[in-house]
Interface confidence: medium
């Protein structure tokens, strides 16, 4: 008789999840010499231990502490790029500007990027059928808690000038409910971080508005200023040209506003 299984609203665990995590770990540690000491089997065991046999709506940050410990990594604290709702461009940028880092350029972020996972209470099975949706089911699910945990730690580590890429095509350019708005903004350390610089990425080719004057950006400025951190904002009118100029800064067309 087939056992009754909880049907959640979100997609199930990503296909070949254990193999993907392990393979990514091996690849990452081969490419990054400073992480060569990491034992990927132990990393997978710690990752698995955070959610296997646990109710997928009852996961805590403590569940991920063994994984956090194994994945401890030092990135240059003044080279951090946060992003909100514009992941692909942020990643394209750090692929070119190799001395800057998004969360997904760190081991733990790289391991989990774009993946979904959850288990079931009291069984060692991974649930490939469905996992809890943050809105429809519960917020304390394995994926959401993981990203909350690593995002908080990443923001806490930042110093000097921190950059954040924001999507100017959204109705809420700064969204208080995003990971950036609800976690990272509140965990920047005022004693270490001097300035948060927002890069607002324009979507429309003919869009010449100053999106730094958007009410949600003003809200972000207010939150940041109250935390004794300076705020600055730049419009990136042409993201394609912006990337091109990061690749080839000597190009004559790169002196004009991007």
């Amino acid at each position: 008789v087939p056992r009754w299984r909880q049907q959640w609203s979100g997609p199930g665990t990503t296909k070949r999840f254990p193999e993907t995590v392990l393979a990514r770990c091996v690849k990452y540690t081969e490419i990054h010499p400073e992480m060569r000491h990491v034992d990927c089997q132990s990393v997978w065991d710690a990752f698995k231990g955070a959610f296997i046999s646990k109710h997928p709506c009852n996961i805590t940050e403590e569940d991920y502490q063994p994984l956090m410990k194994l994945g401890t990594q030092t990135v240059p604290c003044n080279k951090i790029l946060l992003w909100s709702r514009i992941k692909d461009l942020a990643h394209q940028f750090t692929q070119v500007q190799r001395d800057m880092f998004t969360l997904e350029d760190t081991l733990l972020g790289y391991l989990a990027d774009d993946l979904t996972w959850c288990g079931e209470f009291n069984t060692s099975k991974i649930n490939y059928q469905s996992c809890p949706d943050w809105r429809k089911d519960c917020s304390n699910n394995p994926v959401s808690v993981f990203w909350k945990t690593v995002s908080r730690r990443f923001a806490e580590a930042a110093c000097d000038v921190v950059h954040v890429m924001l999507n100017g095509s959204r109705s809420k350019i700064f969204d208080k409910n995003s990971t950036f708005g609800s976690v990272e903004v509140h965990n920047l350390q005022p004693e270490k971080v001097q300035t948060l610089e927002a890069w607002v990425i324009h979507g429309g080719r003919e869009d010449s508005r100053d999106l730094c004057q958007d009410p949600t950006i003003k809200e972000l400025e207010s939150i940041i200023s109250k935390r004794n951190i300076q705020f600055s904002c730049k419009n990136i009118y042409r993201p394609d040209k912006f990337l091109q100029c990061v690749k080839n800064p000597e190009d004559s067309s790169c002196t004009s506003e991007i």
Epitope: I86, D88, D114, L115, S169
Partner: antibody, heavy 121, light 112 residues
Framework: EVQLQQSGPELVKPGASVKMSCRAS????????MHWVKQSHGKSLEWIGY????????NNNQKFKGKATLTVDKSSSTAYMQLSSLTSEDSAVYYC??????????????WGQGTSVTVSS | DIVMTQAAFSNPVALGTSASISCSSS???????????LHWYLQRPGQSPQLLIY???NLASGVPDRFSGSGSGTDFTLRISRVEAEDVGVYYC?????????FGGGTKLEIK
């Protein structure tokens, strides 16, 4: 080299069924989802559904529920689609296409050459 | 279902010049994870479709960098910087943010 080799053209009578195949080579069929897409003559593309060859789980466009049945034979690295109760509306070219990544909403990066189905009495 | 809208034909372009093909969706294709699940395919005459651009702006493997994709949540553009004879065909946009996945009607690239 990744290749998706589809079975040959089919001429079938209204009301009959047809089963077409898509043989994957150059990669492990269980590592990627397999999608099926319909293209009526001179028309656009219509997503029928996909199968996860690892466990046989399928996800179909509601429009093709009861019309298309997706299966896979892992041992021969072959995906199949059976179309039932055929009418002239089902006359089209049917493509199998591999899903680009490990997550269900990724693009289709390799396509078969297509199987032409003609329904005629 | 999300409806993808494309013009049936492009403005005729001369070889070596640039071309733009537009696509719009009835709903935003920007997922809460920050990724826009809009893909572009080219179907050359008598051939199967091939992936050109995935997730709005990423160039698929083996595709020349004359092709680029951009857009917002609902309006998208495929650009070809220097059109070549082999670029002739029908260009389809497709969304994969919400099932059922849907394709645009296709835009035929016209050469002058």
């Amino acid at each position: 080299e990744v290749q998706l080799q589809q079975s040959g053209p089919e001429l079938v009578k209204p009301g009959a069924s047809v089963k077409m195949s898509c043989r994957a080579s150059g990669y492990s069929i269980t590592d990627y989802n397999m999608h099926w897409v319909k293209q009526s003559h001179g028309k656009s593309l219509e997503w029928i559904g996909y199968i996860d060859p690892d466990n046989g789980a399928t996800n179909n466009n509601q429009k093709f529920k009861g019309k298309a049945t997706l299966t896979v034979d892992k041992s021969s690295s072959t995906a199949y689609m059976q179309l039932s109760s055929l009418t002239s509306e089902d006359s089209a070219v049917y493509y199998c296409a591999r899903s680009e990544g490990y997550q269900y909403y990724y693009a289709m990066d390799y396509w078969g050459q297509g199987t032409s189905v003609t329904v005629s009495s | 279902d999300i409806v993808m809208t494309q013009a049936a034909f492009s403005n005729p372009v001369a070889l070596g010049t640039s071309a733009s093909i537009s696509c719009s969706s009835s709903k935003s294709l920007l997922h809460s994870n920050g990724i826009t699940y809009l893909h572009w395919y080219l179907q050359r005459p008598g051939q199967s479709p091939q992936l050109l651009i995935y997730r709005m702006s990423n160039l698929a493997s083996g595709v020349p960098d004359r092709f680029s994709g951009s857009g917002s949540g609902t309006d998208f553009t495929l650009r070809i910087s220097r059109v070549e004879a082999e670029d002739v065909g029908v260009y389809y946009c497709a969304q994969m943010v919400e099932r059922p996945w849907t394709f645009g009607g296709g835009t035929k690239l016209e050469i002058k």
